[in-house]
């Protein structure tokens, strides 16, 4: 239904807390390298200018799209040109190319620096000092950081990341009470950003259907009780929220978000039996905890599937008159009865249906083409459990840290010209898989690992595309959303890689190496790896464990060392010489 | 084996009422459009109302609108047809159509009919 | 509404011949998103129901003999049986499912020479 004024109509819906933290997201995740202080004056305007429009819509420039004001104040930003280059093009364009060249722009690794935790006392005064700041600089820094974080859930992070301090900074220990929930924060927040970031990519390289898609699988695990309708309708509100943040349209996503959790909380009954606990939560914790609720159980006896979708005489009408929602209604009827596949694997079975029938409808006996089309599916399922069961045995026999060192080698080995620092992301990501995963049993660990090794893959999808090296991994990343992971791990050794010439600057290590956590010296000693399968692809996994062995005690004896300078730039010369003579390099 | 199986059909006076049914079997019935088609003694057919059996969404042709109302029981696998303020013009017989998955889908079957006639 | 107009309004023919039934639309029931034609043909024998033939224009119903065809597109539909035989003796029908209220030609009588 159409406003007068949108802005009006926002900041009514979402009232103004929530308004100016949207505006702040929004703005942040567009200009990442804006400095704070410039952003809260901005979103101050806006807010400003909001409220004049609630008084009386139809003030002057009340009536304006919420891209053109935004995109309107994001242009007076003196600094765009020198700040942003190319980006201050985008001010020359009209509506709606102007937010496009402005979504293009978003930078998914940003050139800003590390994000340093203060002592706990510092935080604690900032905190009290001013709480409103400290906590609009916090979503700021995460918005800039990660500008497709889903704004909604940042505003529920926030929530308790405010909780955390008000309870933490009171406490006898601030720093046993806060740095955990600090730790599970920071940790919960890359995982939401990797996951949102996917579901961007999904909609923004694969389109609409592609999404679609996904959402029917995954709801249709989670609501198997739920009939067809009911599932479309939250596939279609939930593809609209997800379109909206995605085109940085926060303050509707957020708001159709609302009205969503609503939505299924009015009709649970209809829905899900598990949602009961969710829907008494305050709105944010909510639309979290719906988004995060664990599967219905299955109705009992459902019917085979091969009534509707193999032996009815119906199937090629049905195709051919409605192709989305007969296959929609093929992919419902699986998933529902499948929480034990992932999510892709159930979006290869229907693609591997869709082609079956795209083939057999047109045949002389469609039937009879199409006939053994489910025994089609046994390989495609296969293939995922017998490289789970082999992986999950290799990282039960390795632990994490070796088992992260493995995929590095292996990754390193299939795709040598990517970054370091990307190989090294994605493979401690990957290797991840490991602990979150590998402790489930047999029914939940195709869904937990193959789930989230396309959200891990997407990531060095992104962070591939902003700077091309490799063309298979372009090809991996492009051709097909749902076989990203199996054209990954296909891949054998890159035979046309010429080794990266031996530099010792990247071998040589200091003492300060001692002072790092321990997350910090494994990432040292990982990046040391990759520039040595960079420098030598073709070293055994023996001749790379010999060396890694031999620089992991080099590192602990210098630590220990009274002249630990003296001892990382003598010991060091000797390590690199060893290591070249045992690679042959 | 497909079946649809109209009944309810009868002798009614002008200004009366009639609820026919269709019961469905050998097919997933809440899966498609069910129809109501009828066809006046020497005439051609005349779709009379539609319903997506999944969601509950009606249509209705113009001469019956706002007197007849389609629905249906998933659960018993049923269609119904209630008729109220009937016409002579009403008078024909009626057929149950299961249509596709969409509302301009073909009606792959077709029930044997059920005779109305709104006579004084 | 859409009108659905069929010509002729009948039609004799002897076994072995063809006959084609011609549907005209008032308006186009090419659907723009996947490119097809919401049109189907039935047939409706004495004293019996009628039966789907023909959708999307020109997809054959399973179990129909292979001499029925329909083709055409947007506005202008044909039917085609290629070599008529003694069962094919019925009123046929046009119907678009393009738009609601859905409608129905007023149907051709074919009857044996």
């Known amino acids: 239904d159409a406003h007068k004024s949108e802005v009006a109509h926002r900041f009514k819906d979402l009232g103004e807390e929530n308004f100016k933290a949207l505006v702040l997201i929004a703005f942040a995740q567009y200009l990442q390298q804006c400095p704070f202080e410039d952003h809260v004056k901005l979103v101050n305007e806006v807010t400003e200018f909001a409220k004049t429009c609630v008084a009386d819509e139809s003030a002057e420039n009340c009536d304006k799209s919420l891209h053109t004001l935004f995109g309107d104040k994001l242009c007076t930003v003196a600094t765009l040109r020198e700040t942003y280059g190319e980006m201050a093009d985008c001010c020359a364009k009209q509506e709606p190319e102007r937010n496009e060249c402005f979504l293009q722009h978003k930078d998914d690794n940003p050139n800003l620096p590390r994000l340093v935790r203060p002592e706990v006392d510092v935080m604690c005064t900032a905190f009290h000092d001013n709480e409103e700041t400290f906590l609009k600089k916090y979503l700021y820094e995460i918005a800039r950081r990660h500008p497709y974080f889903y704004a909604p859930e940042l505003l529920f992070f926030a929530k308790r990341y405010k909780a955390a301090f008000t309870e933490c900074c009171q406490a006898a220990d601030k720093a046993a009470c806060l740095l955990p929930k600090l730790d599970e924060l920071r940790d919960e927040g890359k995982a939401s950003s990797a996951k949102q970031r996917l579901k961007c990519a999904s909609l923004q390289k694969f389109g609409e259907r592609a999404f679609k898609a996904w959402a029917v699988a995954r709801l249709s695990q989670r609501f198997p009780k739920a009939e067809f309708a009911e599932v479309s309708k939250l596939v279609t509100d939930l593809t609209k929220v997800h379109t909206e943040c995605c085109h940085g349209d926060l303050l509707e996503c957020a708001d159709d978000r609302a009205d969503l959790a609503k939505y299924i909380c009015e009709n649970q009954d209809s829905i899900s039996s598990k949602l009961k606990e969710c829907c008494e939560k305050p709105l944010l914790e909510k639309s979290h905890c719906i988004a995060e609720v664990e599967n219905d159980e299955m109705p009992a006896d459902l019917p085979s599937l091969a009534a509707d979708f193999v032996e009815s005489k119906d199937v090629c009408k049905n195709y051919a008159e409605a192709k989305d929602v007969f296959l929609g209604m093929f992919l419902y009827e699986y998933a529902r009865r499948h929480p034990d596949y992932s999510v892709v694997l159930l979006l290869r079975l229907a693609k591997t249906y869709e082609t079956t029938l795209e083939k057999c409808c047109a045949a002389a006996d469609p039937h009879e083409c199409y006939a053994k089309v489910f025994d089609e599916f046994k390989p495609l399922v296969e293939e995922p459990q017998n490289l789970i069961k082999q992986n999950c045995e290799l990282f039960e026999q390795l632990g994490e840290y070796k088992f992260q060192n493995a995929l590095l080698v292996r990754y390193t080995k299939k795709v040598p010209q990517v970054s370091t620092p990307t190989l090294v992301e994605v493979s401690r990501n990957l290797g991840k898989v490991g602990s979150k995963c590998c402790k489930h049993p047999e029914a939940k660990r195709m869904p937990c690992a193959e789930d989230y090794l396309s959200v891990v893959l997407n990531q060095l999808c992104v962070l591939h595309e902003k700077t091309p090296v490799s063309d298979r991994v372009t090809k991996c990343c492009t051709e097909s959303l749902v076989n990203r992971r199996p054209c990954f791990s296909a891949l054998e050794v890159d035979e046309t890689y010429v080794p990266k010439e031996f530099n010792a600057e990247t071998f040589t290590f200091h003492a300060d190496i001692c002072t790092l956590s321990e997350k910090e010296r494994q990432i040292k000693k990982q990046t040391a790896l990759v520039e040595l399968v960079k420098h030598k692809p073709k070293a055994t996994k023996e001749q790379l464990k010999a060396v890694m062995d031999d620089f992991a005690a080099f590192v602990e004896k210098c630590c220990k060392a009274d002249d630990k300078e003296t001892c990382f730039a003598e010991e060091g010369k000797k390590l690199v010489a060893a290591s070249q003579a045992a690679l042959g390099l | 084996e497909l079946q649809l199986v109209e009944s309810g059909g009868g002798l009614v006076q002008p200004g009366g009422s009639l609820r026919l049914a269709c019961a469905a079997s050998g097919f997933t019935f809440s899966r498609y459009w069910m129809h109501w088609v009828r066809q006046a003694p020497g005439k051609g057919l005349e779709w009379v109302s539609g319903i997506n059996t999944g969601t509950g969404s009606t249509a209705y042709a113009d001469s019956v609108k706002g007197r007849f109302t389609i629905s249906r029981d998933n659960g018993k696998n049923t269609l119904y047809l209630q008729m109220n303020s009937l016409k002579s013009d009403d008078t024909a017989v009626y057929y149950c159509?299961?249509?596709?998955?969409?509302?301009?889908?073909?009606?792959?079957?077709w029930g044997q009919g059920t005779q109305v006639t709104v006579s004084s | 509404d859409i009108v659905m107009t069929q010509s002729p309004s009948s039609v004799t023919a002897s076994a072995g011949e063809k006959v084609t039934i011609n549907c005209k639309s008032s308006r186009s029931v090419l659907y723009s998103s996947n490119q097809k034609n919401y049109l189907a043909w039935y047939q409706q024998r004495p004293g019996q129901s009628p039966r789907l033939l023909i959708y999307?224009?020109?997809t054959r119903e399973s179990g129909v003999p292979d001499r029925f065809s329909g083709s055409g597109s947007t506005t202008d539909f044909t039917l085609t049986i290629s070599s008529f035989q003694p069962e094919d003796v019925a009123v046929y029908y046009c119907q678009q499912g393009y738009d609601v209220p859905v409608t129905f030609g007023q149907g051709t009588k074919v009857e044996l020479k």
């Open positions: 999307l224009a020109s």
């Open positions: 159509a299961k249509g596709g998955l969409v509302v301009g889908g073909g009606y792959s079957d």
